[in-house]
């Protein structure tokens, strides 16, 4: 059904309306308000902007907007007392010292509180030692230093290049290792695209710029401080050397500058193959240590940042349904950047802020949405996810009841090759749909469909005819309500084209070069792009929160789910002897897949033909597909990570940035040929197999006809 | 259940050579990396060499004291380990057990005596 | 060469009893230590590995204890089956080695 049914007000009022009133000049306007001054989580300006946000989104037509705050831990670097890295030689002296700041932008010489890049909740510490190059310090790559090249870390500082997988997770794997400290650099090879200038002249990263960013492992718990619970005013924290996922060994980044002048010294064992080798002219040999005539030099690192329990203040926006006000559809993102924030996250949100006017602006004309939508302007997320966190772990009893759908709306763009979506199966019949009806704002698709495009430049690797749509992993605000507590979750914005530009992310990701200019000057000067994604983003918001029946597709859920089980199985048959020894049976995810495969395609069956004037049977519908995605929840979480309890998806053990698919059973596998124990291992994975085909069948059940 | 049957010890006099075998069943041995370790008569254990599997691209390390003297192959295909032993001398005398990865498992060894 | 140095190298001990075991080595093998037990005329049986882990079947009377460079095997209420030799190894870094072995006799 339309959306023009879902309230009784004039069809004028319809999705075609919304997406009307959206316009990339506001966009524009917004983005260029947000990023003038820094606004790190913590601090004042960012209070204030706060604050403004509040203000505005009154003035858009909200029925109410409030502050929300928090008391977490957040970590900034010593003001009088800066972190360095430093080359010593035998007696001690400094003969070589990293850079204290990047050089700033031009137009931004004279702004004050850019604070200088560092691993924010580095511990303190002034660790010398020898070098050794880890590579991008993968499991992987620990594993070819350590199985292959008999290299041992121990007692040694690390030096890892940023890209491939999350920060967090490298500096997990150094410890691991038994690294005292770890470098993080940028290397050209993944942070300068061939052909393109650096800023200011283009949106290369420069050899002075460099990536700030957490560096913990908090596996979906929040404030360190108050895992499960709101960091609010009686709030019971935990000591600090109890916090969760605080790194144990100093970290701190530098840029490619200075890491040539680590890395041109380095001794020891050659790289083992091509995939270690950076594009900076330097051997990358692996160390320990430097060459010959530098033999005795060592590397010295200086960290004294300090960790402190700061408030923070999200913006929670409310807009009352009409028809079900007892039902949340939420658009969040975040509002904090580690400095102008040009593309994370103010690029999100302005679309966010434009949303909100538009939906303001219908409101203001007499229509309302069946469900209700809450907009939120999350705080701390680069230093955690913290404020999306602790913001769901204080109203989680009514967002597990209540909670339909969540949209997240970080960085608009990381490009402006094509659309990126990752999402529930849920809601890929939706993402089809909405993308078929929006124009594609791509060069050479002029009068073409957004799906179009979208499908030409990312088709799925399964089925033709169809764009790529991903896995949620982790990293951003959804991580929460997807992952914790089983909201059907999705998230667009454009990016680059992955073939062609093998960079990670986008170059000047995290660095003060990401400003207004580098968007309006190289990425998207016609702000096209942000508009597309705001119609993406807006639209989806729109559908849920006001078609009559929920716009989720259970079908589409049982086609991944046996995808998802072919391929672990296949893992798993790596193993065969193994498998027959310790009676290792994947029959019961089969079949429990093959009930849900039944059962869905049954419900879809009903949902097609049951009177939809019925306001009860409607409900219970509806009602049954909300609770679908929240039906794959074990309260009990995964093993060693109770706050990431969906059983089909989680974020790597390995990279949480990327999404796994039945996780428990994946990481009981991984690497099982190295346990030393089989019998213990193979019965773990057995038992991972049981819960995953008891969710699954638990699962199809909630689709069964209720009597 | 996991099984490491070794094969191919006796008498063999200084400077000769001899071929031990191990033949494993029970595990998926081609994911597995395997050792010798030996153990002389009334004295401890000695690891004397281990090799990895295809995706360590059959990696081999041994031990100071047999270095240049042995070598250890795998064949995949026959679930079989083998530890070429040439140069024996008197102190190599011992029993020799293979072993997978981590000393989990152990076989029954194979006595070699190198004696004139 | 890292060297593991087992102490007592044999103990007198009557059923029931409860005996310790230490080895030592000679710098940081992490976590990295496995025990054996092995009885006349056998092979080793894994007892203990990553320095406190129970090896699957293994009585839990087999405690293991340490990290870094100090380990302890503890057998409590010795039973007739556990008079044997026991050794501790390390897989840390190459070349792997053992200690020299701790003979449980009966008193």
């Known amino acids: 059904k339309s959306s023009n049914e879902a309230t009784n007000i004039t069809p004028k009022h319809n999705m075609k309306a919304f997406l009307d009133e959206l316009k990339a000049e506001n966009i524009k306007k917004f983005l260029y308000n947000f990023t003038q001054i820094p606004h790190l989580a913590g601090t004042e300006q960012n209070f204030q902007l706060a604050k403004q946000i509040q203000s505005q989104w009154k003035e858009f037509g909200l029925d109410s907007v409030e502050l929300a705050h928090y008391d977490v831990l957040l970590s900034y670097p010593n003001k009088t007392h800066p972190n360095y890295i430093s080359i010593i030689n035998e007696d001690g002296n400094e003969i070589f010292n990293t850079s204290l700041f990047e050089p700033p932008p031009p137009g931004y010489e004279n702004v004050s509180d850019i604070v200088p890049p560092f691993s924010a909740f580095s511990p303190q510490g002034m660790p010398e030692g020898d070098l050794v190059y880890v590579n991008y310090a993968r499991t992987e790559d620990f594993f070819k230093l350590e199985r292959d090249m008999k290299i041992n870390c121990s007692g040694k500082i690390v030096i890892a290049r940023y890209g491939k997988v999350f920060r967090g997770n490298k500096v997990k794997n150094a410890q691991l290792a038994g690294a005292k400290g770890v470098i993080l650099y940028s290397d050209p090879a993944d942070y300068f695209a061939p052909g393109v200038k650096s800023y200011p002249d283009g949106w290369n990263l420069p050899g002075g710029g460099v990536q700030r960013g957490n560096i913990l492992n908090l596996n979906g718990a929040g404030d360190p401080l108050t895992p499960g619970y709101p960091a609010n005013e009686y709030a019971y924290r935990r000591g600090i050397a109890e916090a969760v996922g605080l790194p144990s060994i100093p970290v701190h980044p530098i840029g490619y500058y200075d890491a040539q002048k680590l890395l041109e010294k380095m001794g020891g064992s050659a790289p083992p193959d091509s995939s270690w080798r950076g594009s900076l002219k330097v051997p990358y040999n692996v160390g320990p240590g430097f060459t010959g005539n530098f033999s005795t030099q060592k590397v010295k690192m200086h960290i004294h940042s300090t960790n402190e329990v700061t408030r923070i203040y999200n913006v929670i926006g409310t807009l009352r349904g009409a028809v079900e006000p007892d039902r949340y559809v939420i658009l969040g993102g975040h509002r904090d950047s580690w400095v102008f924030g040009g593309i994370d996250p103010q690029s999100g949100a302005a679309v966010v802020h434009e949303i909100v006017r538009s939906f303001g602006t219908l409101k203001k004309e007499g229509w309302r949405p069946r469900r209700t939508i809450l907009f939120a302007s999350w705080d701390a997320e680069e230093f955690g996810l913290l404020g999306s966190t602790e913001w769901a772990e204080e109203n989680s009893r009514l967002l597990q009841e209540r909670g339909v759908a969540y949209i997240n709306a970080d960085s608009s763009i990381e490009g402006n090759y094509t659309l990126r979506v990752d999402c529930t199966p849920l809601m890929y019949s939706l993402v089809h749909n909405l993308t078929k009806e929006l124009k594609s704002p791509d060069e050479g698709f002029e009068g073409k469909s957004l799906y179009e495009s979208w499908t030409k430049k990312s088709p799925s690797p399964e089925f033709s005819g169809m764009p790529r749509i991903s896995k949620l992993g982790s990293g951003n605000d959804f991580e929460v309500f997807f992952q914790r507590l089983g909201i059907a979750s999705g998230r667009a914005r454009y990016t680059k084209n992955w073939e062609t530009n093998k960079f990670s992310g986008y170059p000047l990701y995290h660095s003060v070069y990401e400003t207004y200019e580098l968007v309006e000057k190289f990425y998207d000067p016609m702000f096209k792009y942000h508009l597309t994604v705001a119609q993406v983003r807006g639209g989806m918001v729109f559908e849920l929160a006001n078609s009559i029946v929920l716009p989720f597709d259970c079908r589409d859920y049982a086609v991944v789910l046996r995808k998802y089980a072919d391929k672990i199985y296949s893992i798993s048959m790596k193993h065969p002897q193994e498998m027959k020894t310790y009676s290792v049976s994947f029959d019961s995810l089969f079949s429990a897949v093959k009930n849900f495969t039944e059962i869905a395609s049954k419900f879809s069956e009903r949902l097609q033909d049951f009177d939809k004037s019925n306001p009860i049977v409607l409900r219970m519908m509806n009602d049954q597909l909300m609770f679908l995605e929240r039906a794959f929840i074990d309260p009990l979480g995964l093993p060693d990570r109770p706050f990431y309890r969906h059983v089909i998806y989680a974020p790597s053990s390995h990279n949480k940035y990327a999404g796994e698919s039945f996780p428990g059973i994946y990481d009981a596998l991984f690497d099982i040929e190295s346990k030393v124990d089989p019998s213990k291992a193979w019965g773990e994975v057995k038992r991972q197999i049981y819960v995953a085909a008891f969710t699954v069948q638990a699962a199809a059940e909630t689709l069964s006809e209720v009597a | 259940e996991v099984q490491l049957v070794e094969s191919g010890g006796g008498l063999v006099q200084p400077g000769g050579s001899l071929k031990l075998s191990c033949a494993a069943s029970?595990?998926?041995?081609?994911?597995?990396?395997m050792n010798w370790v030996r153990q002389a008569s009334g004295k401890g254990l000695e690891w004397v060499a281990e090799?990895?599997?295809?995706?360590?691209?059959?990696?081999?390390h041994y031990a100071e004291s047999v270095k240049g003297r042995v070598i250890i192959s795998r064949d995949d295909s026959k679930n079989t380990v083998y530890l070429q032993m040439n140069s024996l001398r008197t102190e190599d005398t011992a029993v020799y057990y293979c072993?997978?990865?981590?000393?989990?498992?152990w076989g029954q060894g194979t006595t070699v005596t190198v004696s004139s | 060469n890292i060297v593991m140095t087992q102490s007592p190298s044999s103990v007198s001990a009557s059923v029931g009893d409860r005996v310790t075991i230490t080895c030592k080595a000679s710098?940081?093998?992490?976590?990295?230590v496995s025990w054996y037990q092995q009885k006349p005329g056998t092979a080793p049986k894994m007892l203990i590995y990553?320095?406190?882990n129970r090896f699957t079947g293994v009585p839990d009377r087999f405690t293991g204890s340490g990290s870094a460079t100090d380990f302890i095997l503890t057998i409590n209420n010795l039973q007739p089956e556990d008079f044997a030799t026991y050794y501790c190894g390390q897989s840390y870094t190459f070349p792997y080695t053992f200690g020299q072995g701790t003979k449980v006799e009966i008193k």
């Open positions: 090799i990895r599997s295809q995706s360590n691209n059959f990696a081999t």
């Open positions: 029970g595990f998926t041995f081609s994911n597995y990396w």
């Open positions: 990553g320095a406190s």
């Open positions: 710098e940081n093998v992490g976590t990295y």
């Open positions: 072993t997978r990865r981590w000393n989990n498992f």
